[in-house]
Amino acid sequence: SASSRRRQQSRNRSTQSQDVARVSSASDYNSSELKTACRKHELYVSFQDLGWQDWIIAPKGYAANYCDGECSFPLNAHMNATNHAIVQTLVHLMNPEYVPKPCCAPTKLNAISVLYFDDNSNVILKKYRNMVVRACGCH
Amino acid sequence: SASSRRRQQSRNRSTQSQDVARVSSASDYNSSELKTACRKHELYVSFQDLGWQDWIIAPKGYAANYCDGECSFPLNAHMNATNHAIVQTLVHLMNPEYVPKPCCAPTKLNAISVLYFDDNSNVILKKYRNMVVRACGCH
């Protein structure tokens, strides 16, 4: 049984909260798109599945999570959009062939501590930064 | 004539520099893909094109730039990949249907100063954060 698992939930889009721009928000520009809005998805990663079980002693895996979903106009408040992402969204609407939508990426990442063997077979406890996604946004 | 422009250059991928993982790098796993690796693209945004000329006095536009490109295995040193992105890349390869590749997003953003009319027609000079992409990475 594979121990890397993910759960998928749907989430409604709310209206857009803009800092940089006074933009009249289309009520639901991307209602035709079936992909949900940018959000955090749960993902448990097993170090065995990654083939790292021979050098990582503990933990056996961790809740890494990941970001996925659309960053479409209008960007709502939950999307933690940067000012640049708001501008890029509008430019994408005008020039979809040339400029992509902003992408759904981690906005907050946490560290985890890992106990592992180094190249000399010493047991090391090390904190690895930016391993766990805590929040996502449109960037 | 749209004054939002972008220039695209190709960029070679180098081998992957990993912090979190001891992973042997496939020499060119995604050579068949035509999209270039994650990088910054130049983009000039005209406020007139965005329809903001009536309230933004100056500047007339600015070099916003944007991020685009593949975040494929192996992630090279130029891609400023987080540890999470490295893990996600591997999970994507094992489960491409379920977990996307990391996305190419801004890693450094700069502010610009904008002179504009507020709702009461006062002239305001305000610094808008996170308006200009200075660097991109796989997140």
């Epitope: 079936l34 | 295995f73 249907e97």
Partner: antibody, heavy 118, light 107 residues
């Protein structure tokens, strides 16, 4: 029980299109990716592409040069594979197969024979 | 694209024999390999996933080993119902690629 039931055999003319269906039952349709694999007579297995019914994400084998389209209907728990611009070399048995996260193709349809002949 | 090379393409064996089939990947795919059994006129059946994990309901005489680029499917004691064609499959990005198959025939 978990099963995938495919539509019946088809005979098609070169240049036409075929749409094969795959009805899933016994599990939550949107929780598993659906792949399509074909097998020409006496030949091996060739992966065509997949769909994730949850988000409609698709990926295709470039060998089919835009001729293949995979869709899914959540309301009927059915996946579809459409192949256009058919030629005689497309004569094959077409299979749908479920692939759970972290696993391989664990459940397969019975196969649909598509014969392309003038 | 990753290429999967199976050997031998066919073999003859007797009931009770130990049979070994190998699969080589053109790139390191770690443990991301599956084995399938296919009988004439039937759909493939999953035997092994993640290189070594036995699928539900598969007899313990089947086992998988290997990682990286070299993998092996072993049938410890061949049974009459095991005469079939066996395919390996690399699961490492897309396209998902199959080996050419190994036909196990009765000697």
């Amino acid at each position: 029980q978990v099963q995938l039931v495919q539509s019946g055999a088809e005979v098609k003319k070169p240049g036409s299109s075929v749409k094969v269906s795959c009805k899933a039952s016994g599990y939550t349709f949107t929780s598993y990716a659906m792949h399509w694999v074909r097998q020409a007579p006496g030949q091996g297995l060739e992966w065509m592409g997949y769909i994730n019914p949850y988000n409609r994400g698709t990926k295709y084998n470039e060998n089919f040069k835009g001729r293949v389209t995979i869709t899914a209907d959540e309301s009927t728990s059915t996946a579809y594979m459409e192949l256009s611009s058919l030629r005689s070399e497309d004569t094959a048995v077409y299979y749908c197969a479920r692939r759970p996260f972290g696993n391989a193709m664990d459940i397969w349809g019975q196969g649909t024979l598509v014969t392309v002949s003038s | 694209d990753i290429q999967m090379t199976q050997s031998p393409s066919s073999l003859s064996a007797s009931v009770g024999d130990r049979v070994t089939i190998t699969c080589r990947s053109s790139e390191n795919i770690y443990r991301n390999l599956a084995w399938y059994q296919q009988k004439p006129g039937k759909a493939p059946k999953l035997l092994i996933y993640a290189a070594t994990n036995l699928a539900d309901g598969v007899p313990s005489r089947f086992s998988g080993s290997g990682s990286g680029t070299d993998f092996t499917l072993t049938i410890s004691s061949l049974q009459p119902e095991d005469f079939a064609t066996y395919y390996c499959q690399g699961i490492w990005g897309t396209p998902l690629t199959f080996g050419g198959g190994t036909k196990v025939e009765i000697k």
